[in-house]
């Protein structure tokens, strides 16, 4: 029995819906009391949510997945996954029996966005060309852990005396906080990028420091 | 009446073959997953080997893997186990069982059982 | 390969007493669960299935509980016929499908 999923990863965002694709080809004359579904962890093989005995057997998975009744008969055999959470992602095997066995992996990969970074100075006063300073760029509650890259005016990288550290929370997202030390010069920008590298998405931090006073932008 | 009846069963030496029969009368053979189960003398039930509905898809324990062949004939309504390289280990009561519904699943019809003893 | 556990090994309980029979599965196996019955030189017969469903024409006193890991089959009030060796066999996702090694209920 053929049973088909998605070959990329379905990619879903922390709190929002995810649709778990999965289909077989019913044969003519096909009724739902023919249906064996089994949706499962593929690791653990634990049990996420099943259709036997011509009915919905119910989530087995935190109550937070469904299954769409109305098009199982067609052989779409897709999950909703709802609320999604850092703890779900993995892969998820659709195993489907009528008159014969047939299973396929599906891959979740979920992501939040990381805030728009904030700028610190330390020391944030009194300051001089030639003086060593720390500047911090934290963002927060994001996922997958996130590229952190650091640039001068010019956009030019900068990667000595960098100091990047992720830690995550109770939910799984990570802040990240990136120190970079540099010498000052007469006057130069400092900017911080933090990449998702599932999303694709940029968020931008920067510090302007022109003598006095300085600018955070 | 939904009947089983196994038979082939006897007495054979270590390295042998025997070939189990059984009988499906009273249901659409042709429609459901088959199964063989065993049980040596004084133990309990193992599950040996599956076949669905048009013999596309077979399942054996690890233990019989190599050595045992499930078939099944649905125009004569009978399944088959052919048993090669029997070990004394293979010594048992077969059962044949017909899944309760299209997909496999639990047992609800067994046979009487047929004796295979293993022995020189 | 999924492991089912059954316990006690032997049940001593007299008649009209009530028994409690335990399956426990190495992992989790849903409600792919059956229960079967087996007096000494017949087949067994199918009891439960989907963990708690009663088979066709098993009397009310047998039911079945329990999902994922954890599996009891209960025989209310037992009679001089349910004293038997009783196993229980998942069903879940591929083959092989094994049984527990079986719980014996005998007349105390």
């Known amino acids: 029995l053929e049973v088909q999923v998605p070959e990329d990863p379905v990619v879903a965002l922390v709190g929002t819906d995810a649709t778990l694709c999965c289909s077989f080809s019913p044969e003519p004359g096909f009724s739902l009391a023919q249906l064996n579904l089994i949706w499962q962890l593929t690791d653990t093989k634990q049990l996420v949510h099943s259709f036997a005995e011509g009915q919905d057997q119910g989530s087995a998975y935190a109550n937070r997945t469904a299954l769409f009744p109305d098009l199982l008969a067609q052989g779409n055999a897709s999950l909703r996954l709802q609320r999604v959470r850092v703890a779900d992602e993995g892969s998820f095997t659709c195993f489907v029996s009528i008159r014969d066995f047939g299973s396929a992996a599906v891959s979740l990969q979920v992501a939040a966005p990381y805030s728009k970074p904030s700028m610190t100075l330390e020391p944030n006063k009194d300051l001089r060309p030639g003086d060593t300073v720390t500047i911090t760029c934290s963002s927060y509650r994001g996922y997958p852990e996130a590229e952190v890259f650091w640039q001068d005016g010019q956009g030019v990288p900068l990667t000595g005396n960098v100091t990047t550290s992720q830690m995550a929370n109770e939910q799984g997202l990570f802040d990240v906080h990136s120190v970079l030390r540099v010498v000052l010069g007469a006057n130069g920008t400092y900017s911080c990028l933090v990449r998702n590298p599932v999303l694709q998405q940029d968020a931008h931090g920067s510090v302007t420091i022109t003598g006095q006073p300085m600018t955070f932008p | 009446e939904v009947q089983l009846l196994e038979s082939g069963g006897g007495l054979v030496q270590p390295g042998g073959s025997l070939r189990l029969s059984c009988a499906a009368s009273?249901?659409?053979?042709?429609?459901?997953?088959m199964t063989w189960v065993r049980q040596a003398p004084g133990k309990g039930l193992e599950w040996v080997s599956a076949i669905n509905w048009n013999g596309n898809s077979t399942h054996y324990a690890d233990s019989v893997k190599g050595r045992f062949t499930v078939s099944r004939d649905n125009s004569k309504n009978t399944l088959y186990l052919q048993m090669n390289s029997l070990r004394a280990e293979d010594t048992a009561v077969y059962y044949c069982?017909?899944?309760?519904?299209?997909?496999?699943?639990?047992?609800?019809?067994w046979g009487q059982g047929t004796t295979v003893t293993v022995s020189s | 390969e999924i492991v089912l556990t059954q316990s006690p090994g032997t049940l001593s309980l007299s008649p009209g007493e009530r028994a409690t029979l335990s399956c426990r599965a190495s992992q989790t196996v849903g409600s792919y669960l059956a229960w079967y019955q087996q007096k000494p030189g017949q087949a067994p017969r199918l009891l439960i299935y989907g963990a708690s469903s009663r088979a066709t024409g098993i009397p009310a006193r047998f039911s079945g509980s329990g999902s994922g890991t954890d599996f009891t089959l209960t025989i209310s009030s037992l009679q001089s016929e349910d004293f038997a060796v009783y196993y229980c066999?998942?069903?879940?996702?591929?083959?092989?499908?094994?049984f527990g090694g079986g719980t014996k209920v005998e007349i105390k």
């Open positions: 009273g249901f659409t053979f042709s429609d459901d997953w």
């Open positions: 066999q998942h069903y879940y996702d591929w083959p092989p499908y094994s």
């Open positions: 069982a017909k899944s309760r519904t299209t997909y496999y699943s639990s047992m609800d019809v």
